[in-house]
């Protein structure tokens, strides 16, 4: 025998109190798959969170952070203050990157400039608080037809910076 609940579509639940009739999810709840015996409560986006996507009978709400903040954690479980490029967030707030480091994003930590000499290259464009150095040609690259500029190493994913 087929389970009668398997006929209940997303957005409904199989109501045991009503002879397993498919009942619509109550307000502020949802079921994203069929055959559910209960509907899940919708996530609420309040305070530092704002609603990115409203809850519907078939899908949960999604939150992001209010302007001036960015999400941390899967599903935006926490919000952290933005800083300007050339800064990082410390326990004392947003602070400029120290000399020799940069941050080209509004989040994350200041990272050391690329050391061009490790690759036998010279500095073509100096680094700033906001930008990495651009490494120029090594002597071997000066032969005709050689590319004169190598792009900076791709930025690694910034770690979680202090509050």
């Amino acid at each position: 025998l087929q389970d009668p609940c398997s006929n209940c579509p997303a957005g409904t639940f199989c109501d045991n109190n009503r002879n397993q009739i498919c009942s619509p999810c109550p307000p502020n709840s949802f079921s994203s798959a069929g055959g559910q015996r209960t509907c899940d409560i919708c996530r609420q986006c309040k305070g530092v969170f704002r609603t990115r996507k409203e809850c519907s009978s078939t899908s949960n709400a999604e939150c992001d952070c209010t302007p001036g903040f960015h999400c941390l954690g899967a599903g935006c479980s926490m919000c952290e203050q933005d800083c300007k490029q050339g800064q990082e967030l410390t326990k004392k707030g947003c602070k400029d990157c120290c000399f020799g480091t940069f941050n080209d994003q509004k989040r994350g930590i200041c990272r050391p400039w690329t050391n061009c000499s490790l690759d036998g290259k010279s500095v073509l464009v100096n680094g700033t608080k906001e930008r990495d150095v651009v490494c120029g040609p090594s002597p071997a690259d000066l032969s005709p037809g050689a590319s004169s500029v190598t792009p900076p190493a791709p930025a690694r994913e910034p770690g979680h910076s202090p509050q």
Partner: antibody, heavy 115, light 107 residues
């Protein structure tokens, strides 16, 4: 440095109103809201309510008839008022900054309700 | 409201051992669970947010896992300073709620 500090009378008589302030520094009251959370002696944590950066509030239904949370941006202070207190309201009261989880708390202040 | 139930109520272990603390939610709360450590006379301290993300400055012996209704805090190798009370809390739906706590004591 983000800091929150609760203050107020440590002793309140039954049926009176408990009034606490949370003085903050290191962040803007127009950017962050604050939650109030309490902890009766030897027990767990209980969320009372919150005031958001725009000034709107949310309260736990268990307190809604007797709680008011407000903000005074000129003094960098949030306040909690809880009316008609009983011995069951004896607790350490904390304020915590709203950042989606509670990363920054005050040190807490003990309020005893007794005649 | 969403009820969080922590177990065990008390856990007696020795330094160097592994601690496993459980938190069960009465409803699906996704991954919106945080873990806090509280020592006597102090405010709670955030350890884990979003079920599995270690907060800034928290040692990597602390880890969190789980989603939906079942969550776990693991301390891989207990240090003397880890003996305290641990609370889980949910930030999914209002009113925000906390578990009743697990006391981690020295055996």
């Amino acid at each position: 440095q983000v800091q929150l500090q609760e203050s107020g009378p440590g002793l309140v008589k039954p049926s009176q109103t408990l009034s606490l302030t949370c003085t903050v520094s290191g962040f803007s009251l127009t950017t962050y809201g604050v939650h109030w959370i309490r902890q009766p002696p030897g027990k767990g944590l209980e969320w009372i309510g919150a005031i958001w950066s725009g000034g709107s509030t949310d309260y736990n239904a268990a307190f809604i008839s007797r709680v008011t949370i407000s903000v005074d941006t000129s003094k960098n202070q949030f306040s909690l008022k809880l009316s008609s207190v009983t011995a069951a309201d004896t607790a350490v009261y904390y304020c915590a900054r709203d950042d989606g989880s509670f990363a920054n708390w005050g040190q807490g202040t003990l309020v005893t309700v007794s005649s | 409201e969403i009820v969080l139930t922590q177990s065990p109520g008390t856990l007696s272990l020795s330094p160097g051992e592994r601690a496993t603390l459980s938190c069960k939610a009465s409803e699906n709360v996704g991954t919106y669970v945080s873990w806090y450590q509280q020592k006597p006379g102090q405010a709670p301290r955030l350890l884990i947010y979003g079920a599995s993300n270690r907060y800034t400055g928290i040692p990597d012996r602390f880890s969190g896992s789980g989603s939906g209704t079942d969550f776990t805090l693991t301390i891989s190798r207990l240090e003397p300073e880890d003996f305290a009370v641990y609370y889980c809390g949910q930030t999914y739906s209002y009113p925000l709620t906390f578990g009743q706590g697990t006391r981690l004591e020295i055996k």
